[in-house]
């Protein structure tokens, strides 16, 4: 028969290949079926007959078109600071990834080997640049006009309120105090926000503030991206 | 022969920082993690954070992230340990352990070599 | 945070006798890579620690096959099949399966 009609298993042409999800057998010197993902070869082809396919063990898998004669095993539990994204199943392998509030440190070959809680920014510091799953929170001191009050992982500095009176000055960790009953706030560049952290992490970025057209308004330079070592804690 | 080497004992007051250094000799520096340790007069060891010499990274124990900075020099093979606004419970011995977990899978994944220990007393 | 507890807190040995140390973690010390980091470390006295055991049973370089790790999920056993007076000092379990890194508190090994 033709090689494209041929049924498996069949010797190919000389200096032939196998056909798509097929392989050559060293020993039978046959073109023979593949196992789908799922399965695995039970029994190797002959000359006469096909290889045999068997279904995965629980806790196995194979991912490709395969003729292994065992299922991969899958990989242990996750360790408790890390989640299952996906499950073991017949045809994949089990991901696990570091749980929400933690991103990966150090990384290898079989996985995340250390998973790091995420920064949190102190009260005066917000966050620079959001964590990933695979970086840390950055974060920086909060620029004149601006403030944040909150230990936080995601939290920004924010603009301080703009006072028709001022009860008690803004700082870095403190929003104004005011006597009118109508604060408003200003929009200062050194607050622009970022963008949300990534889903892995539960968030609470501040609504962006509108531009306000307030007596007093100052505009203020924005802040550079490189913080300093301190601003952070554990708590 | 593979070692690390540590500064001299330090007498600080309490508020005042302290920087400890820890030089490494006979092994790739860059292809290794350094932990620093402490241990107070008759207690045991407490891991106060670690450093990626590879890529500079850092991460600290909770209790200690406000205060503590580790860093590198890769050039002379040195890291270093820098505690602030220090206090009289930060009394101790500061080791830096290598920590064999950047390499292969095979590797021993622990504190495999210890410096001497440097020791630091806050007194007023 | 994983915590480490280790018993007896002191052990008199005979020279030449067994000594065993045990130690328990709060959790599971299994990484999602297959692998268990429980180290046991030494520290004579004045001196530095110094590795002994690495992944539950691994001896490190350098190490007397007197000593012997074993275990395996929360529970580990470092022995010494016949103390030498060299070995008095304090043992210490450590898990670097995930931060923070802890230690137990330590056991004294002394000479009866």
């Known amino acids: 028969l033709p090689a494209q009609v041929a049924f498996t298993p069949y010797a190919p042409e000389p200096g032939g290949t196998c056909r798509l999800r097929e392989y050559y057998d060293q020993t039978a010197q046959m073109c023979c079926s593949k196992c789908p993902p799922g399965q695995h070869a039970k029994v190797f082809c002959t000359k006469t007959s096909d290889t045999v396919c068997d279904s995965c063990e629980d806790s196995t898998y194979t991912q490709l078109w395969n003729w292994v004669p065992e299922c991969l095993s899958c990989g242990s539990r996750c360790s408790s600071d890390q989640v299952e994204t996906q499950a073991c199943t017949r045809e994949q392998n089990r991901i696990c990834t570091c749980r929400p509030g933690w991103y990966c440190a150090l990384s290898k070959q079989e996985g995340c080997r250390l998973c790091a809680q995420l920064r949190k920014c102190r009260p005066g510091f917000g966050v620079a640049r959001p964590g990933t799953e695979t970086s840390d929170v950055v974060c920086k001191p909060c620029a004149p006009g601006t403030f944040s009050n909150t230990t936080s992982s995601t939290d920004i500095c924010r603009p301080h309120q703009i006072c028709h009176v001022v009860a008690i000055p803004g700082n870095a960790s403190m929003d104004a105090v005011c006597t009118s009953t109508s604060p408003t706030r200003s929009m200062a560049p050194g607050a622009v926000h970022l963008p949300q952290p990534v889903s892995t992490r539960s968030q609470h970025t501040q609504p962006t503030p509108a531009p306000s057209t307030a007596p007093g308004t100052s505009f203020l330079l924005p802040v550079g991206p490189s913080p300093p070592a301190e601003g952070s804690t554990g708590d | 022969q593979v070692q690390l080497v540590q500064s001299g004992a330090e007498v600080k007051k309490p508020g005042a920082s302290v920087k400890v250094s820890c030089k490494a000799s006979?092994?790739?520096?860059?292809?290794?993690?350094l932990s620093w340790v402490r241990q107070a007069p008759g207690q045991g060891l407490e891991w106060m954070g670690w450093?990626?010499?590879?890529?500079?990274?850092?991460n600290y124990a909770q209790n200690l992230q406000d205060r503590v900075t580790m860093t590198t020099d890769t050039s002379t093979s040195t890291a270093y340990m820098e505690l602030r606004s220090l206090r009289s419970d930060d009394m101790a011995v500061y080791y830096c352990?290598?920590?064999?977990?950047?390499?292969?899978?095979?590797?021993?994944?622990?504190?495999?070599?210890w410096g001497q220990g440097t020791m630091v007393t806050v007194s007023s | 945070d994983i915590v480490m507890t280790q018993t007896p807190l002191s052990s008199p040995v005979t020279l030449g006798q067994p000594a065993s140390i045990s130690c328990r973690s709060s959790?599971?010390?299994?990484?999602?890579?297959?692998?268990?980091?429980l180290n046991w470390l030494q520290q004579r006295p004045g001196q530095p620690p110094r590795l002994l055991i690495y992944?539950?049973?691994n001896r490190f370089s350098g190490v007397p096959d007197r000593f012997s790790g074993s275990g395996a999920g929360t529970d580990f056993t470092l022995k010494i099949s016949r103390v030498e007076a060299e070995d008095v000092g304090v043992y210490y379990c450590?898990?670097?399966?995930?931060?923070?890194?802890?230690f137990g508190q330590g056991t004294r090994l002394e000479i009866k």
């Open positions: 352990a290598r920590w064999d977990i950047l390499t292969a899978y095979y590797s021993s994944d622990a504190f495999d070599i």
């Open positions: 006979g092994y790739t520096f860059l292809s290794y993690g």
């Open positions: 450093i990626n010499a590879y890529n500079g990274n850092t």
């Open positions: 959790q599971s010390l299994v990484h999602s890579d297959g692998n268990t980091y």
């Open positions: 992944k539950v049973s």
């Open positions: 450590t898990q670097t399966t995930q931060f923070p890194i802890t």
